[in-house]
């Protein structure tokens, strides 16, 4: 059976049987989420056009996607380990919603979406075991995060069709520069 | 439970080249990283290279270019051919499933490789 993180299979004196870090446990973590998410792009622009749309087009949402910015110390210049690591894990949070919002917009990818979302929820708990300053992570509100589901999915087909592209280019670039970052950590 | 088992190791000459097989029996996930480590005496355990299930590989500097992962998802099997070996090659070479839904994994018996003249 599969051994859980953190722990030794019975074979304790094998090297190869002590766990993977915590290191390289994240860093798998996110390089499969962004592998599924590349899938969930292929179906998405596959789809639509929504991917040949222009910057400005793109620019023209009302969604709050999590961004990395220069404050939250995850670039080169002005680095800081625990500033990086709360905005990374608040990000993730604050992403939940818009994933939940996915599992409904893909029809031979459905599986990889509920895999990404489920991969991403143990990404926050690797993450979080990482953290010292957990009283600096903010969880969403689950109220807002319900009536913002709400209104995500009363949009038209257009509008929906960009939101889900939105969301998974927002989330490739939020992922990228995390695994920048926790590489340097 | 899911058992790992390992083949295509042995003895090879330096320039020399082997292929390495792991073959996963038992109830897997089909979202999954395959792939290899190694750990030569006395050294660390270093990742070689890993394939997720829709074939996105990743591979350790050391290796690139020389080694080449591939897998069959229909046998549940991934493969690791090595080319150019170099006596820095040598060492047991570990398969490892890594399951990103669950965040458990698990480990082969491991299979000797050994670059010598």
């Known amino acids: 059976a599969p051994v859980p993180p953190g722990e030794d299979s019975k074979d304790v004196a094998a090297p190869h049987r002590q766990p993977l870090t915590s290191s390289e446990r994240i860093d798998k973590q996110i390089r499969y989420i962004l592998d599924g998410i590349s899938a969930l792009r292929k179906e998405t622009c596959n789809k639509s056009n929504m991917c040949e749309s222009s910057k400005e087009a793109l620019a023209e949402n009302n969604l709050n996607l999590p961004k990395m910015a220069e404050k939250d110390g995850c670039f080169q210049s002005g680095f800081n380990e625990e500033t990086c690591l709360v905005k990374i894990i608040t990000g993730l949070l604050e992403f939940e919603v818009y994933l939940e919002y996915l599992q409904n917009r893909f029809e031979s990818s459905e599986e990889q979406a509920r895999a990404v979302q489920m991969s991403t929820k143990v990404l926050i708990q690797f993450l979080q075991k990482k953290a010292k300053n957990l009283d600096a992570i903010t969880t969403p509100d689950p109220t807002t995060n319900a009536s913002l589901l709400t209104k995500l999915q009363a949009q038209n087909q257009w509008l929906q069709d960009m939101t889900t592209h939105l969301i998974l280019r927002s989330f490739k670039e939020f992922l990228q520069s995390s695994l920048r970052a926790l590489r340097q950590m | 439970a899911v058992q790992l088992v390992e083949s295509g190791g042995g003895l090879v000459q330096p320039g020399g080249s082997l292929r390495l097989s792991c073959a996963a029996s038992?109830?897997?996930?089909?979202?999954?990283?395959m792939g290899w480590y190694r750990q030569a005496p006395g050294k660390q355990r270093e990742l070689v290279a890993d394939i997720t299930n829709r074939g996105t590989t990743n591979y350790a500097d050391s290796v690139k270019g020389r080694f080449t992962i591939s897998r069959d998802n229909t046998k549940n099997t991934v493969y690791l051919q090595m080319n150019s070996l170099k006596p820095d090659d040598t060492a047991v070479y570990y398969c490892?499933?890594?399951?990103?839904?669950?965040?458990?994994?698990?480990w082969g018996q491991g299979t000797q490789v050994t670059v010598s003249s």
């Open positions: 038992g109830s897997i996930s089909r979202f999954n990283i």
């Open positions: 490892h499933t890594y399951y990103p839904t669950t965040g458990f994994d698990d």
